[in-house]
């Protein structure tokens, strides 16, 4: 039994880091493998993560963490029974994938303005809470070419756009994702999408 692709991990900078790897053949990850991990400075016995299958030869493990600070470094040991298959380390602050924003809502009752709001996925005491910026994706269900991205570079989790920038009388969907420049993170997953029917009063033509 050998590791084909070494474990790579990403952290949500809050409570979970996810490690994925591939074995050289079909593997029952949960019965055959164990990923041991420990926060280096604690100098205590390692914790055990039981991996799950992620495709035939792929495995994934969700490491539970109480929190993260930038200096944290974890040791990782991948075991198959008594055999050490791989040894490595992981610094969560250098591999951050933020949590996806939630509760995306489109408010259509503001005069000819669409107000999109969503929730910051972090509690106020988490470092990322004040460092997230967002991308909002809006697309038409009827026209695949009608697809746009709005970059929200301020901290407030909201976006206002004129309803008239979208076509009237058709349905749109929106979703939002987050990233944090301070840790050069990857983008989060997209939030679940929300749907609304876009309608607005056409202005009277002046002759």
């Amino acid at each position: 039994m050998k590791v084909l692709q070494e474990p790579t991990c990403v952290s949500d900078y809050m409570s979970i880091s996810t490690c994925e790897w591939k074995m050289n053949g079909p593997t029952n990850c949960s019965t055959e493998l164990r990923l041991l991990y420990q926060l280096v400075f604690l100098l205590s016995e390692a914790h055990t993560c039981i991996p799950e299958n992620n495709g035939g030869a792929g495995c994934v493990c969700h490491l539970l963490m109480d929190d993260v600070v930038s200096a944290d470094n974890y040791t990782l040991d991948l075991w198959a029974g008594q055999q050490l298959l791989w040894k490595g380390s992981f610094k969560p602050s250098e591999h951050v994938k933020p949590r996806a924003p939630g509760n995306l809502t489109v408010h259509t009752n503001v005069s000819d303005t669409l107000l999109l709001t969503w929730s910051n996925p972090y509690p106020p005491d988490n470092y990322l809470y004040n460092h997230l910026t967002y991308a909002v994706n809006i697309w038409s269900e009827n026209d695949p070419a009608d697809f746009r991205i709005y970059n929200v570079t301020y901290l407030e989790p909201s976006l206002r756009i004129a309803a008239s920038t979208l076509k009237s009388g058709i349905s749109y969907r929106a979703r939002v994702r987050a990233w944090a420049q301070c840790y050069n993170t990857t983008w989060s997953e997209w939030s679940p999408s929300t749907k609304w029917h876009n309608s607005y009063r056409e202005p009277f033509e002046q002759h």
């Epitope: 926060l39 100098l43 200096a71 470092y127």
Partner: antibody
Framework: QVQLVESGGGVVQPGRSLRLSCAAS????????MHWVRQAPGKGLEWVAV????????YYADSVKGRFTISRDNSKNTLYLQMNSLRAEDTAVYYC????????????WGQGTLVTVSS | DIVMTQSPSTLSASVGDRVTITCRAS??????LAWYQQKPGKAPKLLVY???SLESGVPSRFSGSGSGTEFTLAISSLQPDDFGTYYC?????????FGQGTKLEIK
């Protein structure tokens, strides 16, 4: 319940040696890092040394590096601090403390043993 | 090393008063902070760990708050038994560091 009992303190002359012990019970000693912390009379708390759960890693405060040695015997559930080349400024109450397996854990301390370095 | 700065260094208050002690870390330590009470000739007694978790058996008049670099220990209604010296401690590295202590005197 977790118990840590220090012993081995006493009066010793400058330049001499002393070995402190800390007997642990009520938890799986071999899973935890262990620390020594000291407090000079009328002063604050100062971290002295730490040893990893299996004894493979040891770290020291600059003030004791090269003079003090931390060790453990997991079969006896006992932590040690060997103190050589003692100085007057090493006079303090020495506490052993249990480390953490997670940063959300509870820290436990012993009641301390007094070391007096005096001629 | 992470430097912990406590204030005030001495505090005089009356029974029934609300008192607060502040601890500032030289860099972010998330919530990896403990508070201790120490009485003369005794070992430090853990009051609060993980910045805001009250140790079992500690009266509910004690509370801890804060994260990152700013932390507070509050006593909602001071009791005669609360005199002593209070210390904060960070544990986000293997070399623990402590605040210099706050001596609480009962008026």
């Amino acid at each position: 319940q977790v118990q840590l009992v220090e012993s081995g303190g006493g009066v010793v002359q400058p330049g001499r040696s002393l070995r402190l012990s800390c007997a642990a019970s009520g938890f799986t000693f071999s899973s935890y890092a262990m620390h020594w912390v000291r407090q000079a009379p009328g002063k604050g708390l100062e971290w002295v040394a730490v040893i990893s759960y299996d004894g493979s890693n040891k770290y020291y405060a600059d003030s004791v590096k090269g003079r003090f040695t931390i060790s453990r015997d997991n079969s006896k559930n006992t932590l040690y601090l060997q103190m050589n080349s003692l100085r007057a400024e090493d006079t303090a109450v020495y506490y052993c403390a249990r480390g953490l397996t997670t940063v959300r854990g509870v820290l436990y301390w012993g009641q301390g043993t007094l070391v007096t370095v005096s001629s | 090393d992470i430097v912990m700065t406590q204030s005030p260094s001495t505090l005089s208050a009356s029974v029934g008063d609300r008192v607060t002690i502040t601890c500032r870390a030289s860099q972010s330590i998330s919530t990896r902070l403990a508070w201790y009470q120490q009485k003369p000739g005794k070992a430090p007694k853990l009051l609060v760990y993980w910045a805001s978790s009250l140790e079992s058996g500690v009266p509910s008049r004690f509370s801890g708050s804060g994260s990152g670099t700013e932390f507070t220990l509050a006593i909602s209604s001071l009791q005669p038994d609360d005199f002593g010296t209070y210390y904060c401690q960070q544990y986000t590295s293997y070399s623990w560091t402590f605040g210099q202590g706050t001596k609480l005197e009962i008026k």
